[in-house]
Structures are given as structure tokens and as C-alpha cells.
Interface confidence: low
């Protein structure tokens, strides 16, 4: 913490200005008042500051507001917001999406940081929810943001805001998180023609079970074999030879690349041997011919 | 027979920088699973690095990571890598990659290499 | 995040006994919960994945229930073999975590 010490005669700051890069840290805590310099915050990101000047400025506002810094001056901190801890962040009240926008554009290109995490979570708990233009904002700066939430925190998110995902957004959520997103993704684009829709909702389908992919099958769609090895195998397992077939279309050749792999090993195993024959693929492992294949899953749900 | 074996264990300084590859052979490297690694500090427990996919290149990695750490892979050579910068002595650690046996049904390491030892100290 | 908690961090156990290895999850994680057994100088084992099943090669003296958060690893019929220490890990997710082991527990056999 800065010694207090009195502002040497004529040094008192009229406004905030470049003049100030000159002053000596003991001076800027000195002469320039907090209530200035949080009236006049846009000004400080166009002057060059050290790291530890920008400590001053912080430690004045933070006098300034001990409860926490009013929306007005947290929209024009800049890069003082590097300056915060997620301590600081916990006790602002953000709730203007031009706000989140500014101090994310400081942040730009770098990873998510714990500050970034904690305005982030502010935000969005302010909100209530994770709306379309919340989530639109995220995502531009952080494509990885959405498969970061848990699935609790992913439940919050309003089928809505679903059309604000792109693909590139879900390349890292995992299953469980998909299984949340799923359902929200089939509601969001329930109105969609079928390949309009198949386009949409691909990226959501390792959530998708399997009277889904059933229905997928009927509508032509040639699901590539990426898409098909993200399926959830307790889904792909009920799938039948010609369900499969219809569902891959073209793609169906490459099952055989993957004939060891989930869920593609797991479904194989199910299938009678003569009807993966019938696919011309050489897929080995299936029930050999003339095997009575009994269906335990009723009983199982009974006992 | 499907193995897992790690190189380029070292004795690196401190804000040094290492990489460390795990050769997979017996595996399909086109095919789908992920390659992960975990490191153990001497006389400590288990620490999950991070994974990637082996097909469509998505990578995972402990919240702790904060991008010192980038795991890569090489389809062709079979290896995925584990690039190390701004070590300290608190990454000092045998490093282990593994392989996750189950794709879609939860996360389980059932192929695990031997470990190779890293050492940060000057 | 999804913080494992093992207990408790050491037990010792008598040839032929039992032996009992809690895990809590800080969420519930259903029944992704795998545990693995380490011994000196070499790569841990797994021994139990999706909370009951036992890996290939794994002999039934080991068992493994719960799910949610609350997890059990039993070791029943001792052997002088199963000096060890064992690790969960919560096989849930990978988004958001710390670290997917649990801290281990030390069993010495006597």
C-alpha cells in the first residue's frame, strides 16, 4: 500500500492526461483525486501507464468503492481490469452486455482467465440465464466457453440461445454435456425442413438417443462417420444393419476403419454376422448365423 | 499388442521448456480414442494433465493447465506430445500417458505407458 | 469443478481380511467412477470402471458400488499382492476440473 503523503504544491491533476505518466507513484496517490479519475476512466487506457502506476489508479478506486466499483466505471477500465482480482470481480453488479464486451475486448486472444471466468459468472447469474445475445457475445471471444460450464449450469441455457452455437463451439463438450444440450438443440430447431435441420443439429447428436437416430435414418441425411463416432453407444447399440446403413448413406464404407472402436465395436457385436455381410464391408464379430439371439431387455425391465 | 511408451523425460532449469512424446503402437491412429497424460511428483498422488482425440484432434485439459501446458499429436508417427513451458521445481513428476478405453461411456485409462521421469532443478 | 475426496489416506490389513476404500465426489458424477491400484516404479492397474465392473483380468476379490457421489472399493481375501495404493477417478467430465483422482489411499498388508 502506498505511504500517505501530501501532493507537492502545483502538482494537483486538473484532469486526467498524459502529463501524469511523469508522476511518481507516491505522487499519483497524492494529487490526483478518485473521484476524477472515476469520472474520467475512458481517458486512462489512451495514456501508457506502468503496471505499477495502473496499481495506484486501482488502489484509488478501491477506496473510492469499498463495496465495489459502479457499472459506470467498470465499462471504461480497459486494461486497469487486468488489474482486478476475481475478488474485486465478485462484488461488481455487471449487467450491460456493452459492459462484458469491453473488458473481454482487453482480454482479447488471450485464454480465459480466473478474472474473465469471474465477470463472466457475475454476469451471467445477474442475467438469470444464459440468453441468446449473452451467449452470442461468449462464444465470439471464447469459442471453447460453452463446453466449460457443467451440466447443471448448461441446464440454465434457454433453447433460444441454442441458434447463437456454432459447431466449433461444442468441439470440447463431452458427453454428459451434449445429453443437457441436446434436447434444447431438437426444440430450437423443431420447425427446420429436414436437411436444414440435420445441418443444425448435428454438432448436438452425441446427446441424441436412440429413437432419434432412428427417425434420422429415414430422412436421408448421410451422417459422416466423425458425427457417428461421437453417438452415445448406449444409443447406436438398438440401431439395426439398415438403420445404420441409411442413417451413414455413403459413409457407411468407413465403419470398417472403425470396426475396433466405440461405439462401432460395441454395435457390431449386436448385429447378426449375415446382416453386416450384406453391407459388402467384411465387418467381422457379429452373431454367427443359425445363433438364436434372445431379447433380455424386457425381462430385465420387469425383474 | 496394443503399448504406450513415453520419452523425453529430463533434467530441465527452471522457466526451461520440454516435450515429451507418447508413442502409441499396435493402436490405429486414425481411429477414435483419446491419449492422455497424468503425472505423479515423487512420493505424491495422480494429477490429470489433459487428453486429445486421436481423430478429431479435440483436446481437454485439467483447469490448472492455464496454457503452459499443449498436448499435440502426429497421425502419421503415432505420438501425441506434451509440450512443457515455464517449468518450476513443482513440475517435477514421472509423466504418464494412458489411454482412455471408453470413448463415449465415461473416461477410464486401461493402457497406460511406463513413465518417463522429468526433472526441474538448476 | 469435480474435487474426488479418498479415505481414509492409509489402512493396514491382515492376510485374508478386509479392506474398505471410500471415494466422494463434490458432484454427482452417476456411475463414472474407476479405480485403479499402484504399485512402486510402475503405471497404476485399472481394476474397476463404471463404479462395479471389473476390468479384464482382475480377480473378484475386488468389488466396487455406490454412485452419485458416494463410492466404495472393497478388497476382500487379502493377499501380501495387494500392497499397494489405490486411486479413484471420476470418469464424468473433463470440463472444469482440477484434477479427475482422488488424493489415494496407502494399504499396507502386515
Known amino acids: 500500500e502506498v505511504e500517505k503523503t501530501a501532493c507537492p504544491s502545483g502538482k494537483k491533476a486538473p484532469e486526467i492526461d498524459e502529463s501524469l505518466i511523469f508522476y511518481k507513484k507516491w505522487e499519483l496517490e497524492a494529487c490526483v483525486d478518485a473521484a476524477l479519475l472515476a469520472t474520467q476512466m475512458d481517458r486512462v487506457n489512451a495514456i501508457p501507464f506502468t503496471y505499477e502506476q495502473l496499481d495506484v489508479l486501482k488502489h484509488k478506486l478501491d477506496e473510492l468503492y469499498p463495496q465495489g466499483y459502479p457499472e459506470s466505471v467498470i465499462q471504461h477500465l480497459g486494461y486497469l481490469f487486468l488489474k482486478m482480482s476475481p475478488e474485486d470481480i465478485r462484488k461488481w453488479n455487471v449487467t450491460s452486455l456493452e459492459t462484458l464486451k469491453a473488458l473481454l475486448e482487453v482480454n482479447k486472444g488471450h485464454e480465459m482467465s480466473p478474472q474473465v471466468a469471474t465477470l463472466i459468472d457475475r454476469f451471467v447469474k445477474g442475467r438469470g440465464q444464459l440468453d441468446k445475445d449473452t451467449l452470442d457475445t461468449l462464444t465470439a471471444f471464447y469459442p471453447g466457453y460453452l463446453c466449460s460450464l457443467s451440466p447443471e449450469e448448461l441446464s440454465s441455457v434457454p433453447p433460444s440461445s441454442i441458434w447463437a452455437v456454432r459447431p466449433q463451439d461444442l468441439d470440447t463438450c463431452d458427453p454428459r454435456q451434449l445429453d443437457v444440450l441436446y434436447p434444447k438443440a431438437r426444440l430450437a430447431f423443431q420447425n427446420m425442413n429436414g436437411s436444414e435441420y440435420f445441418v443444425k443439429i448435428q454438432s448436438f447428436l452425441g446427446g441424441a438417443p436412440t429413437e432419434d437416430l432412428k427417425a434420422l435414418s429415414q430422412q436421408n441425411v448421410s451422417m459422416d462417420l466423425a458425427t457417428f463416432m461421437k453417438l452415445r453407444t448406449d444409443a447406436v447399440l438398438p440401431l439395426t444393419v439398415a438403420e445404420v446403413q441409411k442413417l451413414l448413406g455413403p459413409h457407411v464404407e468407413g465403419l470398417k476403419a472403425e470396426e475396433r472402436h466405440r461405439p462401432v465395436r460395441d454395435w457390431i457385436l449386436r448385429q447378426r454376422q449375415d446382416d453386416l455381410d450384406t453391407l459388402g464391408l467384411g465387418l467381422q464379430g457379429g452373431i454367427p448365423n443359425g445363433y438364436l439371439v434372445l431379447d433380455l431387455s424386457m425381462q430385465e425391465a420387469l425383474s | 499388442q496394443e503399448q504406450l511408451e513415453e520419452s523425453g523425460g529430463d533434467l530441465v532449469q527452471p522457466e526451461g521448456s520440454l516435450t515429451l512424446t507418447c508413442k502409441a503402437s499396435?493402436?490405429?491412429?486414425?481411429?477414435?480414442?483419446?491419449i492422455c497424460w497424468v503425472r505423479q511428483a515423487p512420493g505424491k498422488g495422480l494429477e490429470w494433465i489433459g487428453c486429445?482425440?486421436?481423430?478429431?484432434?479435440?483436446?481437454w485439459s485439467a483447469s490448472w493447465v492455464n496454457g503452459r501446458f499443449t498436448i499435440s499429436r502426429s497421425t502419421s508417427l503415432g505420438t501425441v506430445d506434451l509440450k512443457m513451458t515455464s517449468l518450476t521445481a513443482a513440475d517435477t513428476a514421472t509423466y504418464f500417458c494412458a489411454r482412455d478405453e471408453s470413448n463415449n461411456d465415461g473416461w477410464d485409462f486401461k493402457l497406460w505407458g511406463p513413465g518417463t521421469l522429468v526433472t526441474v532443478s538448476s | 469443478a469435480y474435487d474426488m475426496t479418498q479415505t481414509p489416506a492409509s489402512v493396514s490389513a491382515a492376510v485374508g481380511g478386509t479392506v474398505t476404500i471410500k471415494c466422494q465426489a463434490s458432484q454427482s458424477i452417476s456411475n463414472y467412477l474407476a479405480w485403479y491400484q499402484q504399485k512402486p516404479g510402475q503405471p497404476p492397474k485399472l481394476l474397476i470402471y463404471q463404479a462395479s465392473t471389473l476390468a479384464p483380468g482382475v480377480s473378484s476379490r475386488f468389488k466396487g458400488s455406490g454412485s452419485g457421489t458416494e463410492f466404495t472399493l472393497t478388497i476382500s481375501g487379502v493377499e501380501c499382492a495387494d500392497a499397494a495404493t489405490y486411486y479413484c477417478?471420476?470418469?464424468?467430465?473433463?470440463?472444469?476440473?482440477?484434477?479427475?483422482f482422488g488424493g489415494g489411499t496407502g494399504v499396507v498388508v502386515g
Open positions: 477417478q471420476q470418469g464424468y467430465t473433463s470440463s472444469n476440473v482440477e484434477n479427475v
Open positions: 499396435g493402436l490405429d491412429f486414425s481411429s477414435s480414442y483419446w
Open positions: 486429445r482425440h486421436t481423430f478429431t484432434a479435440n483436446t
